[in-house]
Interface confidence: medium
């Protein structure tokens, strides 16, 4: 066996093993997505997290899983069976993914102000329509998750929620905010979480009531809700995690470039496709 053949064999099995790993990873991601779609309650108790935006994540996970499995399958079979058409398709898919990521990176860096404003507009709409539309639960769950994780409330200020007539206390009642705004570590008083399910949500029955984000909490004392708006919270989070984010993006990009290089190298150095196919007759 020549050095070139052993090199090609090494690349072939390297591509196969790594893509097999990504195929398994993709199928796991897909299974998680399907699990959430079918049975949210058991997933929440398994994960043990409050305010998880399940509706969005179930679809994101399922689609990402299928996509990862698809690409990995092309790489696996293409490398193992030494099929140029599959390796070419694998290279093409990775190139498309890489190009999309580069485009997104450029857009994010050049259109930052517009993106920030678009995000603010989406958040404003979510806040204004909170709890009124059963179709909007995905956006509400996502925003609740952001508030809960970043320990913030509203966009600019927690008072952003007071603008929503539906959440405003009537008469002398306290103002209300979603429970994801609550700083649970600031109080030991369990009764402080005066949960008020909106009348609109009661129409949705058990599903709505089991959803954390459907819970509206009274604000008996300012100290019990996060004082910072999420615009500042997001900026802080991005600032603190910038190196990690850039690192992950670079890592993923380099991994894609590596696989692209290996697949095209393997593809170009294979014998003619017909000779290969003849071998498996």
């Amino acid at each position: 066996m020549s050095a070139q053949e052993s090199c090609l064999s090494l690349i072939k099995y390297f591509l196969f093993v790594f893509n097999l790993f990504f195929f398994v990873l993709g199928s796991l991601i897909f299974c998680f997505g399907i699990w959430i779609l079918i049975d949210k309650t058991s997933f929440v108790s398994f994960v043990g997290l409050a305010f998880v935006p399940l509706q969005i994540w179930s679809k994101v996970l399922a689609i990402s899983g299928i996509f990862t499995m698809g690409i990995a399958l092309l790489g696996c079979v293409g490398a193992l069976k030494e099929l140029r058409c599959l390796l070419g398709l694998y290279f093409g898919m990775l190139l498309l993914l890489f190009a999309t990521q580069i485009t997104l990176g450029i857009l994010i860096s050049t259109q930052r102000a517009q993106l920030e404003r678009s995000l603010r507009d989406v958040v404003e709409k979510t806040i204004q329509k909170y709890g009124t539309n059963p179709e909007e639960t995905a956006a509400e769950e996502s925003w609740d998750y952001v508030q809960f994780q970043l320990r913030c409330c509203g966009w600019h200020y927690p008072q952003d929620w007071f603008q929503v007539l539906i959440l405003r206390g009537n008469g002398s009642e306290a103002h209300r905010v979603p429970c994801s705004c609550y700083n649970l570590s600031a109080t030991n008083d369990s009764t402080i979480l005066d949960k008020v399910i909106l009348p609109q949500l009661s129409r949705l029955g058990h599903l709505a009531r089991s959803r954390h984000s459907a819970d509206i909490c009274a604000v008996p004392a300012e100290s019990h809700i996060y004082r910072e708006g999420c615009a500042q919270g997001l900026q802080k989070w991005l600032h603190n995690n910038l190196i990690s984010i850039v690192g992950i993006c670079l890592g993923v990009g380099l991994l894609e470039l590596g696989f692209m290089t290996l697949s095209i190298f393997l593809c170009r150095n294979l014998d003619h496709v017909y000779n290969r196919l003849a071998r498996y007759r």
Epitope: A113, E116, R120, W155, H156, Q159, F162, R168, H175, A231
Partner: antibody
Framework: QIQLVQSGAEVVKPGASVKVSCKAS????????MYWVKQAPGQRLEWMGY????????TYNQKFKGRATITRDTSASTAYIELSSLRSEDTAVYYC????????????WGQGTLVTVSS | DIQMTQSPSSLSASVGDRVTITCKAS??????VDWYQQKPGKAPKLLIN???TRHTGVPSRFSGSGSGTDYTLTISSMQPEDFATYYC?????????FGQGTKLEIK
């Protein structure tokens, strides 16, 4: 830190125009509306209008519509109010103030610009 | 337009006194009320928004309350730096309107 710095005092003749500027720093200029408020000597504060610096949308108090024009220059993070056909009753201190939304409190204010209309 | 009527127009108080300023709207403004403090020759400063929420950095002696048409600003214990003019404002509907102000003077 967040600052709104207004242009200096102006003395103008009746019938003339004046443009007052308000330079913002320490925050994202396009993310907050800019209000303009008038305070005539010994009088209560009066809301004149506001601009959304992101898209230039303006909302005016009908009382000032036509004689007050609010604009902005996003590259300079500056908001402006131009007052035309000035009369003696326009003599006042004009304040700019930022607000997260239209229907919201004004959390930071400029130092004010005194406009004196005198012949 | 919604009228905001403040009372009293002026008030004399001593350091340590509890002071209450009221503001009455000509129609229900659904807690969309702010309170501002203004010292001579200075710009107004936000104290309370949404009727009862203290703005960042405002001392706890300042508190706001109210609903519907009646709103109150309370200073639990007057300090020398609190002598100023106080304005209420509604931002429920345009044109946003201010009260005529309450001048707090040293007794």
């Amino acid at each position: 830190q967040i600052q709104l710095v207004q242009s200096g005092a102006e003395v103008v003749k009746p019938g003339a125009s004046v443009k007052v500027s308000c330079k913002a720093s320490g925050y994202s200029f396009t993310d907050y509306n800019m209000y303009w408020v008038k305070q005539a000597p010994g009088q209560r504060l009066e809301w004149m209008g506001y601009i959304d610096p992101y898209n230039g949308d303006t909302t005016y108090n009908q009382k000032f519509k036509g004689r007050a024009t609010i604009t902005r220059d996003t590259s300079a993070s500056t908001a402006y109010i131009e007052l035309s056909s000035l009369r003696s009753e326009d003599t006042a201190v004009y304040y700019c103030a930022r607000s997260p939304y239209g229907h919201y409190a004004m959390d930071y204010w400029g130092q004010g610009t005194l406009v004196t209309v005198s012949s | 337009d919604i009228q905001m009527t403040q009372s009293p127009s002026s008030l004399s108080a001593s350091v340590g006194d509890r002071v209450t300023i009221t503001c009455k709207a000509s129609q229900d403004v659904s807690t969309a009320v702010d309170w501002y403090q203004q010292k001579p020759g200075k710009a107004p400063k936000l104290l309370i928004n949404w009727a009862s929420t203290r703005h960042t950095g405002v001392p706890s002696r300042f508190s706001g309350s109210g609903s519907g048409t009646d709103y109150t600003l309370t200073i639990s214990s007057m300090q020398p730096e609190d002598f100023a003019t106080y304005y209420c404002r509604q931002h429920y509907s345009t044109p946003f309107t201010f009260g005529q102000g309450t001048k707090l003077e040293i007794k």
